[in-house]
């Protein structure tokens, strides 16, 4: 049986050798809203899809990427007015005849129920309740995202 001092010393040594996950971006920047492991910025101005894409880049972010239906619902819950549409990072690839995320991956057909046509010059917008295909030239608001990316840090607690 170890004494309490010995036990404390062992605990400290184990802590020194332990690596823990810590987000590189601990808090979302001002005006950005945290949604799980992301920071979201809802624009207050309007733009066509291409300009929205460029604006997010200037903010060192990207147009919103949605992983699944659950993330979609949580994002939609942040939209206050049901008459407003927001561009996200998904558009129609004519060459591949499929919806393509701006990170190069294709849409899993089960993820989003898109209302509207899948055709050239179509981009995806979301409202409080729905997901719409609209002409990419349409001037609406948009959502940028920054990932709260985990960074591996060694932790050395004070002994």
């Amino acid at each position: 049986q170890k004494s309490s001092i010995e036990k404390c010393s062992v605990d400290i040594q184990q802590s020194r050798n332990k690596t823990t996950e810590r987000p590189g971006l601990l808090n979302c920047p001002i005006y950005w809203q945290q949604l799980r492991e992301k920071c979201l910025l809802f624009s207050h101005t309007v733009n066509p899809w291409n300009n929205s894409l460029a604006d997010c880049s200037t903010k060192e972010s990207s147009l919103l990427l949605i992983r699944d239906k659950d993330e979609l619902i949580h994002t939609q819950n942040l939209i206050r007015d049901k008459a407003i549409l927001f561009w996200i990072g998904l558009n129609f690839s004519l060459s591949e005849k499929n919806w393509k995320w701006i990170n190069g991956s294709f849409l899993n057909s089960n993820d989003l129920e898109i209302r509207g046509d899948a055709k050239e010059n179509s981009c995806i917008s979301i409202s409080q309740t729905s997901v719409y295909s609209e002409y990419c030239s349409t001037e609406i608001r948009w959502i940028c995202q920054k990932e709260l990316t985990p960074v591996r840090n060694k932790v050395y607690p004070d002994s």
Partner: antibody, heavy 124, light 109 residues
Framework: EVQLVESGGGLVQPGGSLRLSCAAS????????MSWVRQAPGKGLEWVSA????????YYADSVKGRFTISRDNSKNTLYLQMNSLRAEDAAVYYC?????????????????WGQGTLVTVSS | QSVLTQPPSVSGAPGQRVTISCTGG?????????VHWYQQLPGTAPKLLIY???DRPSGVPDRFSGSKSGTSASLAITGLQAEDEADYYC?????????FGGGTQLTVL
């Protein structure tokens, strides 16, 4: 309370011109796309034209393209429809309508508020 | 000729249920575009009755309901009342612009 009041209708000869106005109140006019919809006597509704909230983008039905021009003055909360080279088939009640969605003419839009309409008669 | 087809007229007795159909094709309703419904009482401007296929604006009684399936949509009115006598129009989107159905005249017997 949202209100849309059209004016400018009247009798015009074929080939003539007319300018319709729609005075809007009760909402932030510059935020909404607006449309003109017409209804010939005893007939159904026909969408004519739409304009984005900023006025930068305009949209037209094929039947009026090149003859009609939609515009807006957000400082006056007023929507316009300039109609040139009028034909007998343009005779109708013209309604000004607010698009449901903000900012631009959306493919999925409906029209949530309508004016009372102004009658355009085209006859020689 | 409208790209959205509605029956020219329907009728029903007070208290009954009536439905009005709106049939489109693969370039409008079938392409996933929303369907909206309007009521036009005699001598008045149209009024939005149903938007986004099945949503009711505030103030519209729940006797009115909308649905959409495939290339068609329908408006149902239950508990028919004399004041429901009006023209009803469906609306959607096709090839770059808004389109309306030809309209249906509802007569309350």
């Amino acid at each position: 309370e949202v209100q849309l009041v059209e004016s400018g209708g009247g009798l015009v000869q074929p080939g003539g011109s007319l300018r319709l106005s729609c005075a809007a109140s009760g909402f932030t006019f510059s935020s909404y796309a607006m449309s003109w919809v017409r209804q010939a006597p005893g007939k159904g509704l026909e969408w004519v034209s739409a304009i984005s909230g900023s006025g930068r983008s305009t949209y037209y039905a094929d039947s009026v393209k090149g003859r009609f021009t939609i515009s807006r003055d957000n400082s006056k909360n007023t929507l316009y429809l300039q109609m040139n080279s009028l034909r007998a088939e343009d005779a109708a009640v013209y309604y000004c309508a607010r698009d449901y969605y903000l900012y631009d003419y959306i493919t999925q839009t409906s029209f949530d508020y309508w004016g009372q309409g102004t009658l355009v008669t085209v006859s020689s | 000729q409208s790209v959205l087809t509605q029956p020219p007229s329907v009728s029903g007795a007070p208290g009954q249920r009536v439905t009005i159909s709106c049939t489109g094709g693969s370039s409008n309703i079938g392409a996933g575009y929303d369907v909206h419904w309007y009521q036009q009482l005699p001598g008045t401007a149209p009024k939005l009755l149903i938007y986004g296929n099945s949503d009711r604006p505030s103030g519209v009684p729940d006797r009115f309901s909308g649905s959409k399936s495939g290339t068609s949509a329908s408006l149902a009115i239950t508990g028919l009342q004399a004041e429901d006598e009006a023209d009803y129009y469906c609306q959607s989107y096709d090839s770059g612009h808004t389109v309306f159905g030809g309209g249906t005249q509802l007569t309350v017997l």
